[in-house]
C-alpha cells in the first residue's frame, strides 16, 4: 500500500494488557532441618508486577529468603567472603556484591567455614541456582489479552485492535486466527523458535510486535494489526553476565514486634509490546 | 582463563637468595591478581605475596622485607625475589591468580587463598641450615 501520493503518518498508540491463568506451584521447603514438598496455587496478583510502559511481567521461577531481620551474621560463603583471619574482613566495607556492612570480624559460618560478619538483613540470601524445572512452568499455558489502541491524528483517524463481535474465546494463531488479541504465552515462544521451559528457568525478555500498515483511502481501505514476536534479551550471555530476567522484591511483616522480611528474588518473562506503522491517505 | 607454571625452586643454603618465576599463559594476564603461597610438610597452605593488577602488594609477615614481588605483565611473569632465606622458609611454593576483571581484589583481601582460582602445581624451596 505504499503509494507515491498518499500522505504518511506514524502511528501514536496506547497498549492495555491483561493476563489470565492459574499455575499450581509445588515449592520444596525446609522446616527444622526436614525437606518438605508445599503445594500453592498462584493467581494473577501472585504473578504479575505492574510495570510501566508498553510491558507486562510474569514470574516463571523464584528464590526465597525467609525470616530476614537486621542483626549481625556471617556472609554467605563465596570467594569474596570467606575468610581465614579478621584481616580478611575489613569494618564499615562494603563490597558492591556483598549484602551487608562488613563489622572486620572473620567468623563461623557453618562447620570450618568462616566469612566476613555484616550487618545486614540476616540470614543472608544464598547463592544458589534457580529451580530446575520452573516453579511456574505452567506459565506457558497463561493468556495475555492486548487492547491497542491507534491514532492518526493528521488524518482524524482513529481505531483499535480489538472490533465490535470479536470472539473473545479464541486464541493467536499466525495462519488460521491472526486478528485474535489473545495469545498463548507458550505459543509466543514457540513462533520465536525458543522452548518456554527452558527460557522460564533464568527469565528472559520478549518482544510483540504490532505493526499498522494502513492505508487509510476510502475506496482501498484497510488498517489491521500484524502481530510477529522477537526474543529480545541474549540467549548467549554466559553466567558471569547474569543471564535472563530477574529482580528482588521484599514482602514485609510483623514478628513479636520485630520487623521482618521475606526476600524473593524473582526470575520471569518480561513482554515488551512494541507498536509501529504508518498511516497513509490521499 | 589462566595456566601457571612455577620455576626457579631448589636447594640454597641459610641466609641465601633464590628467585622463583611465575609463567601465565592467557592474554588478559594484566587483569589478574598474582599471589605466592607456600605449604610445608603437615602445615597449612600460608601466604607469602601478592601483587594486584594495578600494582598494590601485600607480604606475610613472616617474609616482610625479605622478599620482593613483581609483575612484567609484558612477559605475563611475576617473580618472586627471596631474599635472607631461612630453613623456616622451606616449602612447596604455589603461584595463584585471582581474576579481577569484574572487581578489583580490596588490598585487605590479597592474603586470602579463596580469593585466588587458579593454581599452579608448586616448585620445591630446600633451605638447609
Known amino acids: 500500500s505504499d503509494k507515491l501520493y498518499q500522505r504518511k503518518e506514524p502511528v501514536i498508540s496506547s497498549v492495555h494488557t491483561k493476563v489470565k491463568g492459574i499455575a499450581e506451584v509445588k515449592e520444596e521447603i525446609v522446616e527444622n532441618g526436614v525437606k518438605k514438598l508445599v503445594h500453592s496455587v498462584f493467581d494473577t496478583a501472585d504473578y504479575t508486577f505492574p510495570l510501566q510502559g508498553n510491558s507486562f511481567f510474569v514470574m516463571t521461577n523464584f528464590l526465597k529468603t525467609e525470616g530476614q531481620e537486621q542483626r549481625l551474621c556471617p556472609e554467605y560463603p563465596t570467594r569474596r567472603t570467606l575468610c581465614s583471619s579478621d584481616r580478611g574482613c575489613k569494618k564499615g566495607w562494603m563490597d558492591p556484591q556483598s549484602k551487608g556492612i562488613q563489622t572486620g570480624r572473620c567468623v563461623v559460618y557453618e562447620g570450618n567455614q568462616k566469612t566476613c560478619e555484616v550487618s545486614a538483613w540476616c540470614p543472608i540470601e544464598a547463592v544458589e541456582e534457580a529451580p530446575r524445572p520452573a516453579l511456574l512452568n505452567s506459565a506457558e499455558n497463561f493468556t495475555v489479552l492486548i487492547k491497542n489502541n491507534i491514532d492518526f491524528p493528521g488524518h482524524n483517524y482513529t481505531t483499535r485492535n480489538i472490533l465490535p463481535g470479536l470472539n473473545i474465546t479464541c486464541t493467536f494463531h499466525k495462519t488460521q486466527n491472526p486478528q485474535c488479541p489473545i495469545f498463548r504465552l507458550g505459543d509466543i515462544f514457540r513462533e520465536t523458535g525458543d522452548n518456554f521451559s527452558d527460557v522460564a528457568i533464568q527469565g528472559g525478555i520478549m518482544g510483540i510486535e504490532i505493526y499498522w500498515d494502513c492505508n487509510l483511502d476510502r475506496w482501498f481501505h484497510h488498517c489491521r494489526p500484524k502481530y510477529s514476536f522477537r526474543r529480545l534479551d541474549d540467549k548467549t550471555t554466559n553466567v558471569s553476565l547474569y543471564p535472563g530476567y530477574n529482580f528482588r522484591y521484599a514482602k514485609y511483616y510483623k514478628e513479636n514486634n520485630v520487623e521482618k522480611r521475606t526476600l524473593i528474588k524473582v526470575f520471569g518473562i518480561r513482554f515488551d509490546i512494541l507498536v509501529f506503522g504508518t498511516g497513509g491517505k490521499f | 582463563e589462566v595456566q601457571l607454571v612455577e620455576s626457579g625452586g631448589g636447594l640454597v643454603q641459610a641466609g641465601g637468595s633464590l628467585r622463583l618465576s611465575c609463567a601465565a599463559s592467557?592474554?588478559?594476564?594484566?587483569?589478574?591478581?598474582m599471589g605466592w603461597f607456600r605449604q610445608a610438610p603437615g602445615k597449612e597452605r600460608e601466604f607469602v605475596a601478592a601483587?594486584?593488577?594495578?600494582?598494590?602488594?601485600d607480604y606475610g609477615d613472616s617474609v616482610k622485607g625479605r622478599f620482593t614481588i613483581s609483575r612484567d605483565d609484558a612477559k605475563n611473569t611475576v617473580p618472586l625475589q627471596m631474599n635472607s632465606l631461612k630453613p623456616e622458609d622451606t616449602a612447596v611454593y604455589y603461584c595463584?591468580?585471582?581474576?579481577?576483571?569484574?572487581?578489583?581484589?580490596?588490598?585487605?583481601?590479597?592474603?586470602?587463598?579463596?580469593?585466588?582460582?587458579?593454581w599452579g602445581q608448586g616448585t620445591q624451596v630446600t633451605v638447609s641450615s
Open positions: 592467557g592474554r588478559t594476564f594484566r587483569h589478574y591478581a
Open positions: 595463584a591468580a585471582a581474576d579481577e576483571t569484574l572487581g578489583a581484589v580490596p588490598n585487605f583481601r590479597l592474603h586470602e587463598k579463596y580469593e585466588y582460582e587458579y
Open positions: 601483587i594486584s593488577s594495578y600494582g598494590s602488594t
